[in-house]
Structures are given as C-alpha cells and as structure tokens.
Interface confidence: low
C-alpha cells in the first residue's frame, strides 16, 4: 500500500492570506489570517462593505486593502487618533490672514471669506467691495447707494410710495372717499392764505348808503369776512369774526369805533348776516334779528361829485390797513358766504367771476376739523426748550386723525441743514386696509404701530412724548416707553437737532432729499394738532398752502350726499 | 402689584345716572390706559370707554351721548357716569388697566 | 362695529380632553385678537394676546391660532379649573368688541 503524500506540499493555500495549512487524509485545510477567506483563503474581505460593521465603522472613507482596510478622512479634514473618526480643520486659525480684511469662516472641509450684506469679496485685494445696486437699475424712480446697501425712493410729493417689494412704486391710494362736491355759489373765503380773495367796486348814486347782506359758514373763530372802504381810503368798515362772534370796526372823519356783539356764529352752520347803514346807526342782524346797532355821526362814506364810490374786499383788506385797524385781526379765514347782496345791488357780476374759477368754490358740506389734501404743507416756528424742564427740550404731542390716504408724513421736524431729525408719518400696512404709524430720525424709523384701522369715519387718537432720555408713545392699547438705551444713537441725533432751530411741518415735507426720511407724501386727510398743550390753528402758521383748510374738514362720501342746508357738523373723535 | 376696586350704588333708578368710582393702587392713573367695561345679564361683555394717562377720553358711540369718564389724579381714583339709565344698563361694570389688570366688577342693576 | 362670532355657545368636555374655541370676525383684523377666561364669580383674566402670545402665568396648555378673520383658542388636556366661560376681543379698530363668549363645562 502506497503512503498518502503531505497534502500541504507543495502548499495549496494563497500565500498572502493564509495563516497555516493542515494536513488531512487526501485532503488540507487553510487556515485564513484575518482579512481573507475561501476554501484557500483566496478571497479578500472587503470590510467596508461588510453588513455588520457598514462603512467598516468610518466616519468618512472606508478604503479597502487586500486582507485590510483603513479609514481615511475628506479634505479639510483629519483623523482622530482612533484611527475611525474625522474632525475638522479650522483653517481660519491655522492661517489667520487668509481672507484679509474679510471675516473667515470656518465650514465643514473648508472655509469661506465672508463679506457684509452689500459687499462683494474681491480675491486679488482679499478684501469687500461695495457692491453699486444702484447699477444694476435695482428701483423704479430714485436709488441711493450706500456702503453695504442701497435703499429705493419714490417720490412721495408726485403721490407715490415704494411697493411692498422695496423697488418698485406704485399711488398712494385713497382709503377713506370724501365728499369734496363744492358749488360755485358758495364763496370759499380762505382760497388764499395771505391776500383778499374778491374784489369789487361800485359807483352809485350819492343817496347809496352801505349795505351787504351775505349767508355765512364756518367754524373758525377769528378772521375777516369783509372790508369796504372809499375811494381815497379816508373811510372805512370791518366785518370781522372774532371769538366766533361778529365784529365791526369802523372809521371815518367823524368816528372810530369797535363793536363785537351777537351770539356764537362759527358752528358750522348757514348763518344770514346783514350789515345795514341807516341814517344815524349802523344795523347788524344775524337771522334777520339786530345784533347790534353802532351809532353814527353822519354818513359812513362821503359822496364825492354826486356818487358814492366804494370799495369792497371779501376775506382780507389791502396791507397797509392793518396798521389802521383799532384792534388788530389776523385776518385769516376758513369759512364760506352765499346769497350776498351788496351795497342792493344783488349778487349780479360776482358770479361770473367765481363761476370760472373752481378754488373759490365752497364745499357743499364741511365738519370740524383741519384738512390737508396730499399737495402741501403747514410751517410752524415752535419753541420746544422749557428752562423749567430738567430735560431741557420736549416734544408732547396729541394727533386727531381721519385719514383719507394711508402714506403720508403727519409732522416733521427740519432743521436748517435739511434734515429730519423727527417725523410722525403714516403708510399702508401689509396687512390688508390698515396702516401704520411710522416715527422716524432721520432716515431710521425708531418705532413703528402696527396695523391699526385708520382709515375710518371715526378719528383717531395718538399721544407721543419725546425728550432727549426716552419716546413714549400713547396708544389705547397701551403705553410704548423706547429708552435711550434702545434708542441712543437716534435719540443723540434728536436731541443735537433740538439744540439749534428746528421748524415744524404739518401734513409733510419742505423740499428736503427723498433719502432724508422713510416717507415722503404728503398726509391726507383730517387732523388736529396738539403740541406741549397749545392747539395748532393753521391760521397762524409761519406758511400754509392755500389748498390746507384750516378750519373745516370735507365729509365721508356718502352714496346719497347732504344737500348745503343739511349740514349736521359732527366730530367723531377719540376725544 | 396693580390693583382695583370698583364701588358705587348697586340699585339706580331708571332716567337717573349711574356713578362709579375706580380706586387704583400699585401704580399710578398718570400713565397707561384706564378702562370701562361692562358684562350685561346674558354673559355679553361691552367696551365702554377709556382715560388715558394725560386725560383724554374716548367713549364707545353706542354710549357717547350719556357717558362720562373723569379722573382724580390726587386720590388716584377714576370715575364713571352714565346718564338717563334703563333697564338695559343693569350689568356687572369692571375697571380695567389695559386689560391685563381688572377690578373684580360691581353689580349695578337699574329698576324703579 | 366688527362682530366677532364665538362658538360653540356652550361645550361639555370630560377632564383631560383636548378643546377648540372659534371665534369668527365680520371682518378682517389683522392679527388684533385677545382671548379671556372668566370663572365664576371671578374678573375676566388674559390668556393670550394678538392671537397666539402666551401670557405670563398662564398654563402652556392654552394655545392660540389663526389670522384674518378665523381664530381658534385650544386647550391641550383640560382641567378642572379650565371651567368656565371664554370671550374673544377685537382691538383691530374701535370700538373694541367682544364676542359672545364659550361656555366651557363639566360633562
């Protein structure tokens, strides 16, 4: 019987992975080194696939080796000591001027030279750039660019505001109609804010004593209904408003004489006035019942050369009368006159005139109030420093509004280098038919009320206080104090502002740059104005445009519109 | 901490006025928003009106012929006035700083 | 006036349900919307205000949502001391009003 020979020579088993050979009867066995396996230990182990231990246990790359395998790490990355795990290079340490004069960011493999909003990274110089957006045609009117921004403007005095998209511009529109249907038989005595508004003469025979019977509305106080004077200015008579009662100055070679009388006529209500020259008096009547009867010597104006020539100014005189007058008038008037009947000669050739020209009509129906019609502006010259006020200077400030348009600048102040340290201003809000109330320094808004319904025929409330420490905003749902720390870089600008002159705007802005303040509209719409407990009448304003009425405020456009002789003045206010 | 205390008549007579008095104490009438409401029998709250801090008002039009509110900054106390009451008025009248804080409300019923 | 429409009128839940209070405005008010609880015998007390901000010392259980002019007051788990009546409030324009109230009670 042959010997069976050693199976294990010459050896069966793949050299590289096994680890022993065994020798059996006919037959061997490999025994494998980790790493291998087969019948031979033929076959390498790919370890990063094996289903037990996925990735072979790498936190990143798993490399296969022959009867092996290693861990390897990405880029920007190296691996920890036990020899599985990555951990990240944080190259902005390790080179610390890599990005120059841009901040370095460290992210995961890499690192990025970060760059402000508005900036752009230049590699050669390794350091940010502004980026022009105004270049690249970013705005549909007006763009300013900034460094690190730019902000679009459209030109709020023309009637537009910047679009929710902050580029585009679209019309402020109207959010509360109103009734502005005037009649060209009503005369609007406060077409001008400085000047007379009619002017008539009349030459009739000498036996014509003065006479003017006019229907009369309004709801100021004080100012000039009427001024008739004779050809050589030696005579003359006032018809005057004040303290809402009528007054009568008149002069003449024989006298000089004051009057007030009668009861209380600025109620927003037609109230018929007749002015009446008798032999020896002067008859005043309100509803046709003498208020007063003023004596006289002899006749009112002399008749030369047999007639008496007059001459008649409505809602005004000519300027070197003022210094005439017994007691001065500001002569400013807000109201209207219908039916009049001067000197009895009816009310024939006036209506001529007023027909054509459309500002000297009245509108059919007014309430209480001031109105700005979204072209022009209010000036005041206001004294804000209180020596009793440790603070030094305040800003209390009460707005009644009933807004018609919901963009618009309510109060600024400007001081003389064109800017504006403070603004009050309103803009639609995103939410639908509301608004918010915008306060502003400058060009910053400090403080914004949120979706508030304005819009409405009720008026609305708002009290601010300002001083150089804090801004307190009073609104019913409640009491907003923003501090000088929140606030003390724009309360600083505020308060350097106050220091010089300051003029204060009402219903908008004097020609100040469109970048000067985040609104630029005009306000429209009714509002009242309180400032440190002083009720701004815009008959005293240093300037007013003529289209401000100071002393009535249109309706809420109504389907079905009050006739002139209905006139229910009402006042819906948070007062 | 903010408190207040409703009083006044619980029984007022139809045509008369109705009179309320709010005490505050733990904060002063001179800032903030200082409220009227009211709780009819069938659970139906009403907004009535406001003083401010500065001592401006603002009524509910549904009431703003016959209401009144006034203050007393010296005794901190703020009041109310309802003018030619009816049965209707009978409710629970609260004072309210804002509406975070609220008296516990008074009952005021209105019969002849 | 904006009407603000509450409901259900009346609710009956067993402790450690959860619950759903609506309240529907005539009208859209922004996010302008205040929710009270008013216990028996007790003053109305704030939950949450403009429409979902939790108020100090009130339980996170109570949470609110909506926007516009549909609102929805819930309470995650009532307890017993959830019972009582629930208003909604408008501020959106004046005069602020309330709604009818939910009755929440003890089934």
């Known amino acids: 019987v042959n010997a069976i020979p050693d199976q294990c020579s010459p050896l069966p088993c793949n050299e590289d992975g096994y680890m022993s050979c065994k020798d059996g009867k006919a037959s061997f066995t490999c025994t494998c080194k980790p790493g291998w396996q087969g019948e031979k230990c033929e076959f390498d182990i790919n370890e990063c696939k094996d289903p037990s231990n996925i990735n072979g246990g790498c936190s990143q790359i798993c490399d296969n080796t022959p009867g092996s395998y290693h861990c390897s790490c990405k880029s920007g990355f190296v691996m920890l000591s036990n020899k599985k795990d990555c951990k990240d290079v944080d190259e902005c340490s390790l080179k610390p001027n890599m990005c120059g004069t841009a901040v370095c960011k460290n992210i995961p493999g890499d690192f990025e030279c970060e760059c402000p909003e508005g900036y752009r990274y230049n590699l050669k110089s390794k350091s940010c750039e502004d980026v022009d957006e105004c270049s690249e045609n970013m705005c549909a009117q007006l763009c300013v660019n900034y460094p690190g921004g730019y902000t679009c403007y459209c030109d709020g005095k023309k009637g537009f505001k910047l679009a929710q998209d902050q580029k585009s511009c679209e019309a402020v529109s109207v959010c509360l109609p109103l009734n502005l249907d005037t009649k060209y038989e009503l005369l609007y005595l406060a077409e001008q804010f400085a000047g007379v508004v009619l002017y008539l003469k009349f030459r009739l025979p000498e036996i014509s004593r003065f006479s003017a019977e006019f229907d009369f509305r309004t709801y100021d106080s004080q100012g000039v209904i009427l001024y008739a004077e004779s050809i050589d200015h030696s005579a003359w008579l006032l018809i005057a408003l004040r303290g809402g009662k009528i007054e009568v100055q008149l002069k003449n070679e024989h006298t000089s004489k004051i009057t007030t009388g009668g009861d209380i006529i600025n109620n927003g209500l037609w109230n018929m006035v007749s002015v009446e020259e008798l032999e020896h008096s002067i008859s005043i009547k309100i509803a046709k019942e003498a208020v007063m009867d003023i004596n006289k010597p002899g006749p009112l104006f002399k008749p030369e050369n047999g007639l008496l020539e007059t001459k008649v100014y409505f809602a005004g005189f000519p300027r070197k009368v003022e210094s005439e007058l017994i007691k001065p008038i500001n002569p400013r008037l807000d109201g209207c006159i219908r039916s009049w009947n001067l000197m009895k000669q009816g009310a024939s050739g006036i209506k001529e005139i007023i027909q054509e020209k459309q500002n000297k009509h009245c509108l059919v129906t007014v309430e209480k109030g001031s109105y700005y019609p979204g072209s022009g502006i209010a000036e005041f010259h206001i004294d804000y420093n209180n020596g009793s006020n440790a603070e030094g200077w305040h800003i209390n400030v009460t707005l009644n509004i009933r807004p018609s348009m919901g963009t618009g600048v309510m109060l600024a102040l400007v001081s003389s280098n064109n800017t504006v340290p403070f603004a009050v201003s309103l803009v639609d809000s995103t939410s639908e038919k509301s608004q918010d109330i915008v306060i502003s320094v400058e060009n910053t808004v400090i403080y914004r009320i949120q979706a508030l319904s304005l819009c409405s025929n009720q008026r609305s409330h708002l009290e601010f206080r300002v001083n150089r420490n804090n801004l307190e905003l009073l609104t019913p749902l409640k009491i907003e104090t923003i501090s000088q720390e929140e606030l003390q870089t724009q309360l600083a600008i505020l308060d350097k502002a106050m220091k010089g002159k300051v003029a204060t705007y009402l219903g908008g802005l004097p020609d100040v740059p469109f970048s000067a303040t985040p609104v630029n509209a005009f306000y429209n719409g009714c509002m009242e104005v309180n400032i440190n407990g002083v009720e701004l009448d815009l008959d005293e304003a240093i300037s007013k445009h003529n289209d401000i009425r100071a002393h009535s405020c249109p309706s809420v456009w109504k389907k079905t519109k009050n006739s002139e002789d209905q006139v229910d003045p009402r006042l819906i206010d948070g007062k | 901490e903010v408190q207040l205390q409703e009083s006044g008549p619980s029984l007022v007579k139809p045509s008369q006025t109705l009179s309320l008095t709010c005490s505050v104490t733990?904060?002063?009438?001179?800032?903030?928003?200082w409220n009227w409401i009211r709780k009819f029998p069938g659970n139906k709250l009403e907004y009535m009106g406001y003083i401010s801090f500065s001592g401006s008002t603002y009524y509910n039009p549904s009431l703003k012929s016959r209401i009144s509110i006034t203050r007393d900054t010296s005794k901190n106390q703020y009041y109310l006035q309802l003018n030619s009451v009816t049965t209707e008025d009978t409710a629970t009248y609260y004072c309210a700083r804002e509406f975070a804080y609220w008296g516990q409300g008074t009952l005021v019923t209105v019969s002849a | 006036d904006i009407v603000l429409t509450q409901s259900p009128a009346t609710l009956s839940v067993t402790p450690g349900d959860s619950v759903s209070l609506s309240c529907r405005a005539s009208?859209?008010?922004?996010?302008?919307l205040h929710w009270y609880q008013q216990k028996s015998h007790e003053s109305p007390r704030l939950l949450i205000k403009?429409?979902?901000q939790s108020i100090s010392g009130i339980p996170s259980r109570f949470s609110g949502s909506g926007s516009g002019t549909d609102f929805t007051l819930s309470i995650n788990s009532v307890e017993t001391e959830d019972f009582g009546m629930y208003f909604c409030q408008q501020s959106n324009s004046w005069p602020w009003t309330f709604g009818g109230g939910t009755k929440l009670e003890i089934k």
């Open positions: 733990g904060d002063s009438i001179t800032s903030g928003y």
């Open positions: 009208q859209s008010i922004s996010n302008n």
């Open positions: 403009f429409v979902s």
